[in-house]
Structure formats: structure tokens, C-alpha cells
């Protein structure tokens, strides 16, 4: 039950007080008692009921017409019903016993009002009123948690607007106010009660600038609503009316959570006592609501497709009308971004990446754009953030990022169990140097940090410095799977790739080419390639490298071997020893559901048929996968991407609720 | 075969700024290595910066790391290098040199460490 | 102080050889087959004429030949021509904090 305020009484003269229905009000009976008295009696009107505890051990009796004896360790505390109709309409009478005096009588004219601020703390959809069932000061996680949740307010449901929400002190509309959460001042006063009392609504100074509250008048537009709390506002006094009465405010968060942020916002409604104009106003009461701000969540290659992105350039209308029918097949929508907007700048993934934000009314997409800044750099801004449609950036945007900042460099892992922790939206991945030193290169500590300060996706710190582009997405993929997990991890492999191809010279396929069909490309040799010492010793590095990520994933996602499936690939190794894909990289593959959009190696022919499509279809069909192998040699693999890097995809949200997990 | 012309080049005082470009014409410096190279007045060549085609990572000499950046615009077909917090030892002919990376072979073999085609350098100088 | 050590100077009659030393480490000349050399003549830019120890770009006359033995890489010049007087650098890719490090440069008199 909510804390009340202390109420002294005086046998002086009657004491006035206000009491809020749900809390617990302190009577301070022994301060101001007469001297020689040594026990006293309560009596009370019906509405009120009085608690006496004489501890400790605390032994509780509600008044009868018993004495008790006057003594600090006593303890009285009174709660009310039932709001009052009219002011001092509940009386409570102390009578005060000595042993030679006649007893000395203490009044108290008590108010009740009821005054409660409500929001979905029960995480429902709805807001309930709750009158201090449960203690809304708190926010819990997991399915028996409680506390209620705040949309950053990203999208941009103004189209004629190039900012995004939140950023304006308006509310455009009930589309703008679905994205917000509502809160519910409930109040139950004597109609005179506030030419006495004020009501303020506040929010911390550290928060203020992370938060804005709109009041809406009831029965009017939406766009009646408007701002008390916010940036520049910390506090705004309530025009409150007495009797019965609603008030609804519609909240919107400002920033998402980040390490300087921990993502809780406290509203707090404060009751004033204003009767006297010679003093400063006095606190009588405060309700709080805690919100925490929904994190931003990535969705893995596990989770359904519902747009695919990918971008117009010279001459890659083959790899579009590939890219088109998969989106097909997979039943997406497709959206292309076209040459005069991407500027020559076709790596999609790397520009941004597509997630969500959940209250329990409302999910909204949301797109993280990088600080890369290239080509694409307007494109998230002014293609996708729209209306239900979310934008978050981090990072400088000018300078001072290096390739990790790309989002091929950031991926996520489907549901894992790690040693018994719960994974349930999977864990996020992203590529490192292993060591710092004075050229190794790191994702931007800003972009670090914001994703870690989501919580709900513990972020996994992989090494990738080794390649030239330095992405995670150059050596692993996650495709679903109808068994044991329900996903396999798909890595890059040069050891699978050499056993390959000696099974296939030792069958007398030696002169079996290796790009043939490729104009302008030398072709090589299977028994050229095997016979290459200098190729061997690079890809016997790369395949260290990708061995400690192997073991990084297995123990970081509770992996075992058998949810690993090695992928054929070959690596050379060129400026500064960073390594590049040999041949187009086939773990850089576009999944959306069972259809996957897999770089084409052109590997050595065999029988008819490119014995590394044919050795990739062997291991994905069994899963039920279809692999379709898309040409990407010229306008992507020789420019250091593949299908992966050029593309994007929004997916479907988690069922589950990030709220019902513990981080 | 790629030109390179350096500009940018200027008096400057101790703690200042420049901003030196290297534009390429005959050809898309996309697909090349670039790297800056510096030789103060009668003394030898020494290596400044390199940034690699892809534009996915960079490198520098000691001397200048943490006040000089290289960067590279393939659409511009120019690379550039940004020079803060300058001294008078950054006095020299700045050149922009670059190696193609459009390698055959099986394993490409070094381009990045050797410059095949140079510009004719711009001066700096910084003084007070 | 450069971190790759040539001779100041050589000089030699036209028509005979000349070889330029360039001395480095282990975890330079002597770890990597990654040595250029370049030729520079006065108020010109360097022209590379050796790299990868001892292949020659096309155009690079074969009288140009490169070689490298231990941490000691080498530049010899033979059937000397008068046009060949210029400063000559060697260069090494380093696993040192500076992965790209340059000799002193050696001035060529042809007498």
C-alpha cells in the first residue's frame, strides 16, 4: 500500500488532513499529548478504519473502545474507504486518560480523495486502474513482472514532414497517438477541494529530456492534445475540477536506451496542500508510474520475411530479376532502391538494419541506420522511416568510423539456451579486432553501447579484423532448420573446401576449372589450386581465425558440432594480410524462409554441374531449403560483397515478448 | 593506366589545417590501393597512409596516426587526406600514389605495399 | 632516421654494374617478399622500377634487377647509362607499427 503522509494531532484545536484512498496515514497521537496522561482510546466514523499496533513484535487490533497506553511503541495508522463528499466529513476522535484528570479529547477531520495514476502495468494492452494493488514504482521482468512500456515515438506519420516524431511538441493524429502509452489521472474529490490543493505532474530533470507527456481532452480531437511535460517542462500543474474526474495523457519516449540511459522514466503526480498563501505549498501525497522505453530488437534469419531491399545499379539487372523472384517466392514485398538515389552505392546491409520496437499495444518496425554514411546514407531516412515505420541512428556522422561500423558486421542469432540462460530473441553478433592495437579496427564504442544498453539480445563480440571488409557476415549465416534447434549455424569453411576438391581430383577431375564462363577471369585448376602452397597457408590462417569463432559461438550460443554445417569456401589473403573470398563467398547468402539467394562459386564443373552448388545443395536440402544460386561476380563479389551485403530484409516480429524474458 | 593530381596543398601554421585531394582521371580509383607518401625538403621518401579499394580500412605511419586521416570517395574518384594539429616536421611534397588491386592471381601479391603510379606531389608547409 | 639502411651514395662508370644494398630486419626485409625499390630523379616523382623483391613492371628495362638474401635486400644496375643517374629507395612492407617503411634513398652517379 502507498505511503501516506504523518498527521499530528493537538487537543489544542481540531486538526484538518487529507487522506488518499489506498494509502497508509501515520497519526502522530503521543507528540502533542498532555502531560500526565498515560493511555488513550480512538474512535472513528465508519468511513475511516484505524490500525494500533503496539510492538515490536507489531500485534495489530482495530479500535473498539479499548485504551491503550501512551507510549512511543505504539503505532496508529489509518486508511479510508471511501472518498469523501464533502471536506472533513470523516471525524476521528482521540481520547487521552490519566489517572487524576478527566479525559482530554483530540479531533481530526479527515478528507478522502482518491487520486491515482494509472498506466498498463499489467502489460496487457489495456490500462486498468489499480489503486495501489500493486506498487507501480517498480518495474519487474518475466512473465509474473509488472511495469508499464514507452515507444521511442520514431516513426514519421506526417509525410510532409522530414523529421521524426518526437521530435516535434505536436500530436498529428490518432495515428501519432497509437504510438504513444497511455495514462490515466483518475481523481475523486469534495467539489471545493482544489480552491485548497493543486495536483502536479513531474519528471525527473535526468529524464526530463527523454521523455514527453501530452494531456488529451477528453471527448475532443487529437489534436487538442498538448504538451505538459517534456525537454523544456519538467513539471505542469493540473487544472483539476472537484468531484469525480478522468484525465488522459498520452506519453511518448525520446530516446531509446543507452549507456547513459537505462531506459526507466518515472512520472510522478504529486497532491499540494495550498491553503495557506503565507507558506510554501506542502506535499500531501505523490503516485508514480515507472515506463521503461522498449528496446530496440534485431530479428534473425530464423524469423519470416516480409520486405526484402536491394538496390539499383549499372548493370545488375540479372541479379534483380534474381533477387525479385525469391522475394516472390517467399511471398515479399520488394523494394528497390533506385541509381539516382543510392549513388552508386549498392551495399544495402551495410546501411542499415531493420528491427522492431513492441509496447503491448503496438509494434513498430524500426530501422538502425549506420554511421557509414555513403551512397545509401538518405536512404533510411527518406524511404523507410514513414508512418509505422521507426528510425534510430548512433554514432558520429561525419568521420571517425572504420568498416565495422557497416551493418554486414552486425547480425543476430536465432533463440538460444546457453548453460540453462534463456535466450528467447537470440543473441546479437558483431565483429572485433582480437587485441587493440595501433590499425586494429572496432565497431564505434557509441554503437557498442547502444546495443548492449537494449538488454534483451546480450551482444556476442566475434572476430572479423582478419578480413579485408572485416564483417561477420562474410564467414557465417543462419538458416532455419524443421530439427535440434530449430536454425544451423552456416560458417565458411576452406578445410571443407580442399577436402572437396581432392575427393574431385581424385576421381581424375584435376583439370576441372575453377570460374570458367567468367569473361575477363583466369581460370584456375582444381590441381593448380591444391597444388598452391602460398593459397594453403592463407587459408590455413583464415581457418584459425574462423575456428576461434567457431568455438566463441559454440560456447556464446550453446552450440554443438552437429548444429554446425561447414560451408566450401577459399580465401587469399591480400593488403596487410586481410583476407578477401576466393571465389564468390557463399555464406554471404540472402535468406528468407526455406528460399535462400546463394552467391554462385562458379566452381570447377563436374558431370555437368558446379560440383560447390552441388556439394551446398547436399548439405541445405535435407533441412528443406531451396538453393537458388545467383550471379553476383561482376557487379558485386570482384567490389568485396556478395548477395548478403547487397541486400536487406524486414522480418516478421518475435511472438514472444521481450518484457517476459530476464535479461 | 590511372593519373593522379594532388592539390590542396599550402602555407599553413603550426596547429592548423589542411585538406589534401588526390583526383584520378583515365580511370575508376575504385579499383585501386592508394596511398599517401611525403619527402621533406632534401631528405628521403616516407611512407604517410594507405587506404584500401574497398574502403574498409586504412593504416598510417606513427608520425602522423591520430591527426591524419585518410579517406576515399570512389564516386568523386578522389581520396583525401585530412591533416590536423600540424607541425613544422610535416613540411614536405605530398604524394599520392596508388597500385591497382585487380589481381588474376591465385593469390594476389602485395599490391597495397608497392605504388606503380604517382602523382607529381603538392607542397606543404607549415611555418609561423 | 630511416628504419631501412642503404649506402648514401654509389657510383660507377657507363656500361659497368652497380649494386644498392638495403638493409632491415627480421620482421621486415627479412619476414616479407614484399620489397620495392624506386627511382627518383631530381624534382621528378618516384617511379617504381622493382617490386615483390624482383619482378619489374612492363616498360622497366631489364638491365633492372632486384634480389634479396636474409634481411638484405639488393638493387643491381648493370650496363650503367647515363640516364640512370637518380636517388634509388627501397621499401619493405614491416609487421612494425608503420606497415610500410622506406630506406634513405641512395644517390647513383653514373662517372
Known amino acids: 500500500m502507498a505511503q501516506g503522509t504523518l498527521i499530528r494531532v493537538t487537543p489544542e484545536q481540531p486538526t484538518h488532513a487529507v487522506c488518499v484512498l489506498g494509502t497508509l496515514t501515520q497519526l502522530d497521537i503521543c507528540s502533542s499529548a498532555p502531560e500526565d496522561c498515560t493511555s488513550f482510546s480512538i474512535n472513528a466514523s465508519p468511513g475511516v478504519v484505524v490500525d494500533i499496533a503496539h510492538g515490536p513484535p507489531a500485534k495489530k487490533k482495530s479500535t473498539g473502545s479499548s485504551t491503550w497506553p501512551l507510549d512511543p511503541g505504539v503505532e496508529v495508522t489509518l486508511t479510508m474507504k471511501v472518498a469523501s463528499g464533502s471536506t472533513g466529513d470523516q471525524k476521528v476522535q482521540i481520547s487521552y486518560y490519566g489517572p487524576k484528570t478527566p479525559p482530554v479529547k483530540a479531533l481530526l477531520y479527515l478528507t478522502g480523495v482518491e487520486i491515482s495514476l494509472c498506466a498498463d502495468i499489467t502489460r496487457t494492452g489495456k490500462v486498468k486502474p489499480t489503486r495501489a494493488v500493486k506498487d507501480q514504482r517498480t518495474w519487474t521482468w518475466g512473465p509474473c513482472g509488472q511495469g508499464a512500456i514507452l515507444l521511442v515515438n520514431c516513426d514519421r506519420d506526417n509525410l510532409e514532414s522530414s523529421a521524426m516524431d518526437c521530435e516535434d511538441d505536436e500530436v498529428l493524429d490518432s495515428e501519432d497517438l497509437q504510438d504513444m502509452s497511455l495514462m490515466t489521472l483518475s481523481t475523486k474529490t469534495p467539489k471545493d477541494f482544489f480552491t485548497n490543493h493543486t495536483l502536479v505532474l513531474h519528471v525527473a530533470r535526468s529524464e526530463m529530456d527523454k521523455v514527453r507527456v501530452f494531456q488529451a481532452t477528453r471527448g475532443k480531437l487529437s489534436s487538442k492534445c498538448s504538451v505538459v511535460l517534456g525537454p523544456k517542462w519538467p513539471s505542469h500543474y493540473l487544472m483539476v475540477p472537484g468531484g469525480k474526474h478522468n484525465m488522459d495523457f498520452y506519453v511518448e519516449a525520446l530516446a531509446f536506451p543507452d549507456t547513459d540511459f537505462p531506459g526507466l522514466i518515472t512520472l510522478t503526480i504529486s497532491l499540494l496542500d495550498t491553503s495557506n498563501l503565507e507558506l510554501p505549498e506542502a506535499v500531501v501525497f505523490q503516485d508514480s508510474v515507472v515506463f521503461r522505453v522498449a528496446p530496440w530488437i534485431m530479428t534473425p534469419n530464423t524469423q519470416p520475411p516480409q520486405e526484402v531491399y536491394a538496390c539499383s545499379i549499372f548493370e545488375n539487372e540479372d541479379f534483380l530479376k534474381s533477387v525479385t523472384t525469391l522475394a516472390m517466392k517467399a511471398k515479399c514485398k520488394l523494394t528497390i532502391c533506385p541509381e539516382e538515389e543510392n549513388m552508386d552505392d549498392q551495399w544495402m546491409q551495410d546501411e542499415m538494419e531493420i528491427g522492431y520496437i513492441q509496447a503491448p499495444h503496438k509494434t513498430l518496425p524500426v530501422v538502425f541506420d549506420s554511421p557509414r554514411n555513403r551512397g545509401l546514407k538518405e536512404f533510411p531516412i527518406k524511404r523507410v522511416m514513414g508512418p509505422d515505420f521507426g528510425y534510430v541512428t548512433r554514432g558520429p556522422q561525419t568521420g571517425g568510423i572504420s568498416g565495422l561500423d557497416s551493418f554486414g558486421n552486425l547480425e543476430v542469432s536465432p533463440p538460444v539456451t546457453v548453460r540453462g540462460k534463456e535466450y528467447p530473441l537470440g543473441r546479437i553478433l558483431f565483429g572485433d579486432s582480437c587485441y587493440p592495437s595501433n590499425d586494429s579496427r572496432q565497431m564505434h564504442q557509441a554503437l557498442q553501447d547502444f546495443l548492449s544498453a537494449q538488454q534483451v539480445q546480450a551482444p556476442v563480440k566475434l572476430y572479423s579484423d582478419w578480413l579485408s571488409v572485416g564483417h561477420v557476415d562474410e564467414f557465417l549465416s543462419f538458416v532455419p532448420a524443421p530439427d535440434r534447434k530449430g536454425f544451423r549455424l552456416l560458417l565458411a569453411s576452406p578445410r571443407s573446401c580442399y577436402k572437396l576438391f581432392q575427393e574431385q581430383q581424385n576421381e581424375g577431375h584435376g583439370e576441372a576449372l575453377l570460374f570458367e564462363g567468367i569473361k575477363k577471369k583466369k581460370q584456375q585448376k582444381i590441381k593448380n589450386i591444391l597444388s598452391n602452397k602460398t593459397l594453403r597457408e592463407h587459408n590455413s590462417f583464415v581457418e584459425r581465425c574462423i575456428d576461434w569463432n567457431r568455438e566463441l559461438l559454440k560456447r556464446e550460443l550453446g552450440l554443438a558440432e552437429s548444429d554446425i554445417i561447414d560451408i566450401p569456401q577459399l580465401f587469399k589473403l591480400k593488403e596487410f594480410s586481410k583476407a578477401e573470398a576466393f571465389f564468390p563467398n557463399m555464406v554471404n547468402m540472402l535468406v528468407l524462409g526455406k528460399h535462400l539467394g546463394i552467391p554462385k562459386p562458379f566452381g570447377p564443373v563436374i558431370n555437368g554441374r558446379c560440383c560447390l552448388e552441388e556439394k551446398v545443395c547436399s548439405l541445405l536440402e535435407p533441412l528443406g531449403l531451396q538453393c537458388t544460386f545467383i550471379n553476383d561476380f561482376f557487379t558485386y563479389h570482384i567490389r568485396h560483397g556478395e548477395v548478403h551485403c547487397g541486400t536487406n530484409v524486414r522480418r516478421k516480429p518475435f511472438s514472444f515478448k521481450w518484457w517476459n524474458m530476464v535479461p | 593506366q590511372v593519373q593522379l593530381v594532388e592539390s590542396g596543398g599550402g602555407l599553413v601554421k603550426p596547429g592548423g589545417s589542411l585538406r589534401l585531394s588526390c583526383a584520378a582521371s583515365?580511370?575508376?580509383?575504385?579499383?585501386?590501393?592508394v596511398s599517401w607518401i611525403r619527402q621533406a625538403p632534401g631528405k628521403g621518401l616516407e611512407w604517410v597512409s594507405f587506404?584500401?579499394?574497398?574502403?574498409?580500412?586504412?593504416y598510417y605511419a606513427d608520425s602522423v596516426r591520430g591527426r591524419f586521416t585518410i579517406s576515399r570517395d570512389n564516386a568523386k574518384n578522389s581520396v583525401y587526406l585530412q591533416m590536423n594539429s600540424l607541425r613544422a616536421e610535416d613540411t614536405a611534397v605530398y604524394y599520392c600514389?596508388?597500385?591497382?588491386?585487380?589481381?588474376?592471381?591465385?593469390?594476389?601479391?602485395?599490391?597495397?605495399?608497392?605504388?606503380?603510379?604517382w602523382g607529381r606531389g603538392t607542397l606543404v608547409t607549415v611555418s609561423s | 632516421q630511416s628504419a631501412l639502411t642503404q649506402p648514401r651514395s654509389v657510383s660507377g662508370s657507363p656500361g659497368q654494374s652497380v649494386t644498392i644494398s638495403c638493409t632491415g630486419t627480421?620482421?621486415?626485409?627479412?619476414?616479407?617478399?614484399?620489397v620495392s625499390w624506386y627511382q627518383q630523379h631530381p624534382g621528378k616523382a618516384p617511379k617504381l622500377i622493382i617490386y615483390?623483391?624482383?619482378e619489374r613492371p612492363s616498360g622497366v628495362p631489364d638491365r633492372f634487377s632486384g634480389s634479396k638474401s636474409g634481411n638484405t635486400a639488393s638493387l643491381t644496375i648493370s650496363g650503367l647509362q647515363a640516364e640512370d643517374e637518380a636517388d634509388y629507395y627501397c621499401?619493405?612492407?614491416?609487421?612494425?607499427?608503420?606497415?610500410?617503411?622506406f630506406g634513405g634513398g641512395t644517390k647513383l652517379t653514373v662517372l
Open positions: 615483390n623483391v624482383y
Open positions: 627480421r620482421p621486415d626485409v627479412g619476414r616479407y617478399n614484399q
Open positions: 583515365g580511370s575508376t580509383l575504385s579499383d585501386y590501393f
Open positions: 600514389s596508388s597500385a591497382n588491386d585487380d589481381v588474376d592471381d591465385i593469390v594476389a601479391p602485395g599490391r597495397g605495399y608497392y605504388m606503380d603510379v
Open positions: 587506404i584500401n579499394s574497398a574502403n574498409t580500412f586504412t
Open positions: 621499401s619493405s612492407h614491416s609487421r612494425s607499427s608503420t606497415p610500410v617503411l
